[in-house]
């Protein structure tokens, strides 16, 4: 079964994949795809190398290591929950059925949100109940602040205050909900 790797929303994710070139600079085509490795190819390709260089890539996907030495580990920049899933690293070694293929599972967790001190003070002072983010299950719920009974005007005001903050971004990316009552 595939190996599992984890990252938080907003971080860069790292998926390792290596091979040993027969000689320095004697590179092998490699492809990375989203989805499990099919029988011959790489799935929905996000990055590809040839015998010389990276010849195809999409935004946010890059090789951070020295691919000329066989480090073809994939970095995914600024991940969101949508980046979760299986990734295929396929090392297309020439010859008959010499391919090495690896399925790697990427699990993205909601960011551990630490509100700005002023926002935290305002929340606690104004609302002694709970603001939470919803992750994949109960264990993923994180307390952000306290809230009392809130009316719709207060929710709107709170949303406006959060709109341009980093906290708002974290809430959006992790599928945040405001729980009332």
């Amino acid at each position: 079964s595939e190996v599992e790797y984890r990252a938080e929303v907003g971080q860069n994710a790292y998926l390792p994949c290596f091979y040993t070139p027969a000689a320095p600079g004697n590179l092998v085509p490699v492809c990375w795809g989203k989805g499990a490795c099919p029988v011959f190819e790489c799935g929905n390709v996000v990055l590809r190398t040839d015998e010389r260089d990276v010849n195809y890539w999409t935004s946010r996907y890059w090789l951070n290591g020295d691919f000329r030495k066989g480090d073809v580990s994939l970095t995914i920049e600024n991940v969101t929950l949508a980046d979760s899933g299986i990734y295929c690293c396929r090392i297309q070694i020439p010859g008959i059925m010499n391919d090495e293929k690896f399925n790697l599972k990427l699990v993205i967790k909601p960011a551990k949100v630490t509100p700005a001190p002023t926002l935290q003070r305002d929340f606690t002072a104004a609302f002694p109940r709970m603001l939470t983010t919803r992750g994949h299950g109960p264990a993923e719920t994180q307390t952000l602040g306290s809230l009392p009974d809130i009316n719709l005007t207060q929710i709107s005001t709170l949303a406006n205050e959060l709109r341009d903050s980093r906290l708002a971004n974290d809430l959006r990316d992790s599928g945040a909900t405001i729980r009332i009552g």
């Epitope: 499990a36 099919p38 029988v39 190819e41 297309q92 059925m97 391919d99 399925n103």
Partner: antibody, heavy 119, light 111 residues
Framework: EVQLVESGGGLVQPGGSLRLSCAAS????????MSWVRQAPGKGLEWVAA???????YFPDSVKGRFTISRDNAKNSCYLQMNSLRAEDTAVYYC?????????????WGQGTLVTVSS | DIVLTQSPATLSVSPGERATLSCRAS??????????MQWYQQKPGQAPRLLIY???NVESGVPARFSGSGSGTEFTLTISSLQSEDFAVYYC?????????FGGGTKVEIK
Amino acid sequence: EVQLVESGGGLVQPGGSLRLSCAASGFTFSRYAMSWVRQAPGKGLEWVAAISSGGSLYFPDSVKGRFTISRDNAKNSCYLQMNSLRAEDTAVYYCARGREADGGYFDYWGQGTLVTVSS
Amino acid sequence: DIVLTQSPATLSVSPGERATLSCRASESVEYYGTSLMQWYQQKPGQAPRLLIYAASNVESGVPARFSGSGSGTEFTLTISSLQSEDFAVYYCQQSMKVPLTFGGGTKVEIK
């Protein structure tokens, strides 16, 4: 429009060799796995070779060591070199494009070229 | 190798009727939640044509009367209302493992 045109078929004696060509057009050839599939007269389909976009080769045991597949991305062409031919290799040989991102099934086929192995 | 067994070998159907073709694999062709099974149509003197991929996805340009279903080792191609142009041979094919293999085919003929 995607097109695959096979050539090189014909009559050959047992033990002989033949090289089939597949000229592709209408798509970015280098991005696709290519396969050869054959069909003996009145029989079903049999996959005989594949080459991935990265140049990896795949064969069933029935032809391994006798057939080889290659590609020339600059010429948008794929080739099947058949050696040590046997009577049971007599068939229509189709060039087929593997579906992008997968390669293991075929969304475009040529019209085929007939190979007859007989003395 | 994964052996694909198609049944029946020949199916006699009247135009307008429903046709149900079966393909059984010697082992599961499930892979990360996808069934790696395809269906092709072949008419005399022509190359095969892809109809269904990944068990149930209808290829672009294929009429809606064709549908595929199944998972694991049991798969079905259904033609809801046979048209005259549908009389042909139908093959299933797995893309789970090398060697890629095809079923022996089902000939759909006019009753």
